[in-house]
């Protein structure tokens, strides 16, 4: 999880704590940096990043995606609807981030950092959305069986799944970051 202050700020005359929006923005950028590092290892290890067979594996996954109805895009943007979608989506990604935990050798700590930082980000966003009650939490039983199913895949599918999770999570966070900047 990133420190609450930039090292540059230490010299500042008044070290004020980060505001809610600053914390969220910084947290997302920190997670995106972590995803970049994990993607680097994935792409170096296999040719998944250039594979044209993504659609095969994608059928098995139900990764959260921003859609027009979620109100997070420039056209039809809706602050409340979008905030609910971001939080719901992040909660849905948690099971996939759990899956990633044993998928990395040299970046094992980075994978853990991405997972833990996402939990913190969810907490930040839930505080921001304290008056919104439309947030549904994924069912733990469904998540457990999904995790078992993903871990039972063959090696090629596991590699492809890892690649797709990282790519989708990156896209989701980038869309979230853009949307949050209008909030």
């Amino acid at each position: 999880v990133p420190p609450g202050e930039d090292s540059k700020d230490v010299a500042a005359p008044h070290r004020q704590p980060l505001t809610s929006s600053e914390r969220i923005d910084k947290q997302i950028r920190y997670i995106l940096d972590g995803i970049s590092a994990l993607r680097k290892e994935t792409c170096n290890k296999s040719n998944m990043c250039e594979s044209s067979k993504e659609a095969l594996a994608e059928n098995n996954l139900n990764l959260p995606k921003m859609a027009e109805k979620d109100g997070c895009f420039q056209s039809g943007f809706n602050e409340e609807t979008c905030l609910v979608k971001i939080i719901t989506g992040l909660l849905e990604f948690e099971v996939y981030l759990e899956y990633l935990q044993n998928r990395f050798e040299s970046s094992e700590e980075q994978a853990r950092a991405v997972q833990m930082s996402t939990k913190v980000l969810i907490q930040f966003l839930q505080k921001k959305a304290k008056n919104l009650d439309a947030i549904t939490t994924p069912d733990p039983t469904t998540n457990a069986s999904l995790l078992t199913k993903l871990q039972a895949q063959n090696q090629w599918l596991q590699d492809m799944t890892t690649h797709l999770i990282l790519r989708s999570f990156k896209e989701f966070l980038q869309s979230s970051l853009r949307a949050l900047r209008q909030m």
Partner: antibody, heavy 120, light 111 residues
């Protein structure tokens, strides 16, 4: 074509009130955070206030906090600035500005401004 | 006094290059890549040139470029043209959800 047209400026006595309006057209108003920026005669620019796209969050410069209130009506595509307890130092051209989409803290469109003069 | 420090004026001949500096602190210019630059022609509203330190706004010529080092941002205008004569303002996000501007720099194109 994006257009921001301010109105409601004028001459007011110290301690008085004014309500500025900004009519937006040519874009989906409800998708954008908006701000007011002012410019005193012959001086530089000063950020005044910001409101999120849905009107949930508002922010103010210290110089106007407690006196000015920013609001918006997305159904009418209109941004407002209610100015109370006006002081001579509030005399300026007030610009209605749009935040660039997905960019933090940059204004991609500006209105032509409305003049506010606070004088006895 | 303004929160960000800009030189009051700069000048250059047509075709030449000028750079306008914008000095701040670690709480604003140095905090993140949230610096933007605006051009204001006489009697007109400001117009965005650069955002996020070095990204050119739509329709802005590549003669305009932005950069940042530490707590100081810079706007560079190359191949100066007479129509570049205007006031230029830098702006930056400041920690605590506010925006601060520089005092403005008047660019004179000589000759």
């Amino acid at each position: 074509e994006v257009q921001l047209v301010e109105s409601g400026g004028g001459l007011v006595q110290p301690g008085g009130s004014l309500r500025l309006s900004c009519a937006a057209s040519g874009f989906t108003f409800s998708s954008y955070a908006m701000s007011w920026v002012r410019q005193a005669p012959g001086k530089g620019l000063e950020w005044v206030s910001r409101i999120s796209s849905g009107g949930i969050s508002t922010y103010y410069a210290d110089s106007v906090k407690g006196r000015f209130t920013i609001s918006r009506d997305n159904a009418k595509n209109t941004l407002y600035l209610q100015m109370n307890s006006l002081k001579p130092e509030d005399t300026a051209v007030y610009y209605c500005v749009r935040y660039a989409w997905g960019v933090q803290w940059a204004f991609d469109f500006w209105g032509q401004g409305t003049q506010v003069t606070v004088s006895s | 006094s303004y929160d960000l420090t800009q030189p009051p004026s700069v000048s250059g001949s047509p075709g030449k290059t000028v750079t306008i500096s914008c000095a701040g602190t670690s709480s604003d210019v140095g905090y993140g890549n949230y610096v933007s630059w605006y051009q204001q022609l006489p009697g007109m509203a400001p117009k965005i040139l650069i955002y996020d330190v070095n990204k050119r706004a739509s329709g802005i010529a590549d003669r305009f470029s932005g950069s940042k080092s530490g707590n100081t941002a810079s706007l560079t205008i190359s191949g100066l043209q007479s129509e570049d004569e205007a006031d230029y303002y830098c702006a930056s996000y400041r920690r605590g959800e506010t925006i601060v501007f520089g005092g403005g720099t008047h660019l004179t194109v000589l000759g």
